[in-house]
C-alpha cells in the first residue's frame, strides 16, 4: 500500500500509482473526478479532493488541478451530445450533413458534406460526421436524380407493378417512364418500320 | 431562456398543402441544427427530419418527396413545407432545438380530413 | 433504423412509490439516450440525457442508468406531478427513434 520506496523507479500499479522522484517513493494517483489536494510524504499517501463544478480529471492523475470543461462550439458546428461530468469532458459531435474537417485529440470544426451529384449516393460510414461524403454510383435497376449530400438511390419504378408498360427504361439519373397499356405509342416509339 | 413557437397548423384536405412556421429565440437559431417531430392522435414520437445550419436536411422515408424544411436564419424562422397531405399525416407537429431535441415548442396540429 | 422497445407501455402506482422503466435498443448507442415526461396537451420535456445526466431544474427523484442496449429510468419516491406519460429516446444516429411510451397512472 503507497507510499512505499521504489529503488527502480517503478511502481507496482502504474495505472493507479505514481513514482515520486523527491522522496523516491510510490504514492497513490487520485481517482477521474478528483485533483491532488495535497501531496504525498514518506509517512502520508496522496490526498485528493473532487473537481469543483465545471471541471473535470478524466485519468487517474497526480494533477493539483482539474481542466476546465468547454462547451461545444455551435459556430464551429459543433453540438453537445454528453455533459461534462467531474469524470468526462463535454461529448460533442457534428451537425447532421457535416463531417469533421479539423481534428487535434478532438474535432475543432465541422464542415457542410459535399452533394453527391445526380446518378450517385453517399457511401454510408459506420460513424456519423468523421468524414466527407465519398459519392459513388447508383447500383443497377436504382436512380437518384438531385444534387445532396443526403439523398440515397432509389429502385426504378416496375411499370408492371401498377398494372401499367414501360413506355422509356430507367437511368442512374431518372426512374422508369410508365405509361397506360391502352395508350398508343407515339411514332418514334412505334416499332413498325415502313420501308 | 429557449423558446420555440410554431404556427401554421389547421384543417386541411387530403392532397392540400400548409406550411408550419416555428419561430426561435432565447438562442443563436443560426449556429444549430433544428429537428420536426409529430405526433398523431393517442400515438407515441416519429422523427420527421433535421435540418444543419447550412440548410442540409434529412427525412423519414415516409414523408421524403412531400415535406420540405428550410429555415431563415434572419428570422429566426425554422419552416416545414407539408404536400399531399394524407389522413395518416394528422398530427400535433412539434420542433425541437437541436439534432438531439433538447428543447420543444408546444406543437401546431394538422388536421387532413375531408 | 434503430428500434427502441420501451416496457411497460403502462403501468399503475401510487405516490411515495418507486417505479422503474426500461428501455431497450435494437443495436448498441453507447449513452447517446434521452428520456422524456409528456403531460396531456403539452410539449415533451427532456428530463434526462446522455443515459445518466439530469436536465437542470429536473428533480433529483429522477434518475437514468444504462449503456449500450440497456436502459432504465427510475422515480424514486413518486410525487402527484410525476403522473405521465414517459418517453426514451435514441440520438446515437441522427435519425432519432422513440420508444412506444410508458403511461403512468395513478393506483
Known amino acids: 500500500v503507497p507510499p512505499y520506496g521504489s529503488e527502480n523507479q517503478t511502481c507496482r500499479d502504474q495505472e493507479k500509482e505514481y513514482y515520486e522522484p523527491r522522496h523516491r517513493i510510490c504514492c497513490s494517483r487520485c481517482p477521474p473526478g478528483t485533483y491532488v489536494s495535497a501531496k504525498c510524504s514518506r509517512s502520508r499517501d496522496t490526498v485528493c479532493a473532487t473537481c469543483a463544478e465545471n471541471s473535470y480529471n478524466e485519468h487517474w492523475n497526480y494533477l493539483t488541478i482539474c481542466q476546465l470543461c468547454r462547451p461545444c462550439d455551435p459556430v464551429m458546428g459543433l453540438e453537445e451530445i454528453a455533459p461534462c461530468t467531474s469524470k468526462r469532458k463535454t461529448q460533442c459531435r457534428c451537425q447532421p450533413g457535416m463531417f469533421c474537417a479539423a481534428w487535434a485529440l478532438e474535432c475543432t470544426h465541422c464542415e457542410l458534406l459535399s452533394d453527391c451529384p445526380p446518378g450517385t449516393e453517399a457511401e454510408l460510414k459506420d460513424e456519423v460526421g468523421k468524414g466527407n461524403n465519398h459519392c459513388v454510383p447508383c447500383k443497377a435497376g436504382h436512380f437518384q436524380n438531385t444534387s445532396s449530400p443526403s439523398a440515397r438511390c432509389q429502385p426504378h419504378t416496375r411499370c408492371e407493378d401498377q398494372g401499367l408498360v414501360e413506355a422509356a427504361p430507367g437511368t442512374a439519373q431518372s426512374d422508369t417512364t410508365c405509361r397506360n397499356p391502352s395508350e398508343s405509342l407515339p411514332p418514334e416509339m412505334s416499332g413498325t418500320m415502313l420501308m | 431562456e429557449v423558446q420555440l413557437l410554431e404556427s401554421g397548423g389547421g384543417l386541411v384536405q387530403p392532397g392540400g398543402s400548409l406550411r408550419l412556421s416555428c419561430a426561435a429565440s432565447g438562442f443563436t437559431f443560426s449556429y444549430y441544427a433544428m429537428t420536426w417531430v409529430r405526433q398523431a392522435p393517442g400515438k407515441g414520437l416519429e422523427w420527421i427530419g433535421v435540418i444543419n445550419s447550412g440548410g442540409g436536411t434529412y427525412y423519414t422515408d415516409s414523408v421524403k418527396g412531400r415535406f420540405t424544411m428550410s429555415r431563415d436564419n434572419s428570422k429566426n424562422t425554422l419552416y416545414l413545407q407539408v404536400n399531399s397531405l394524407r389522413a395518416e399525416d394528422t398530427a400535433v407537429y412539434y420542433c425541437?432545438?437541436?439534432?438531439?431535441?433538447?428543447?420543444w415548442g408546444q406543437g401546431t396540429t394538422v388536421t387532413v380530413s375531408s | 433504423d434503430i428500434q427502441m422497445t420501451q416496457s411497460p407501455s403502462s403501468l399503475s402506482a401510487s405516490v411515495g412509490d418507486r417505479v422503474t422503466i426500461t428501455c431497450q435498443a435494437s443495436?448498441?448507442?453507447?449513452?447517446?439516450l434521452s428520456w422524456y415526461q409528456q403531460k396531456p396537451g403539452k410539449a415533451p420535456k427532456r428530463l434526462i440525457f446522455?443515459?445518466?445526466s439530469l436536465e437542470s431544474g429536473v428533480p433529483s427523484r429522477f434518475s437514468g442508468s444504462g449503456s449500450g442496449t440497456d436502459f432504465t429510468l427510475t422515480i424514486s419516491s413518486l410525487q402527484p406531478e410525476d403522473f405521465a406519460t414517459y418517453y426514451c429516446?435514441?440520438?446515437?444516429?441522427?435519425?432519432?427513434?422513440f420508444g412506444g411510451g410508458t403511461k403512468l397512472e395513478i393506483k
Open positions: 425541437a432545438k437541436a439534432s438531439t431535441a433538447d428543447v
Open positions: 443495436q448498441g448507442i453507447s449513452n447517446y
Open positions: 446522455a443515459a445518466s
Open positions: 429516446q435514441q440520438y446515437n444516429s441522427y435519425s432519432l427513434t
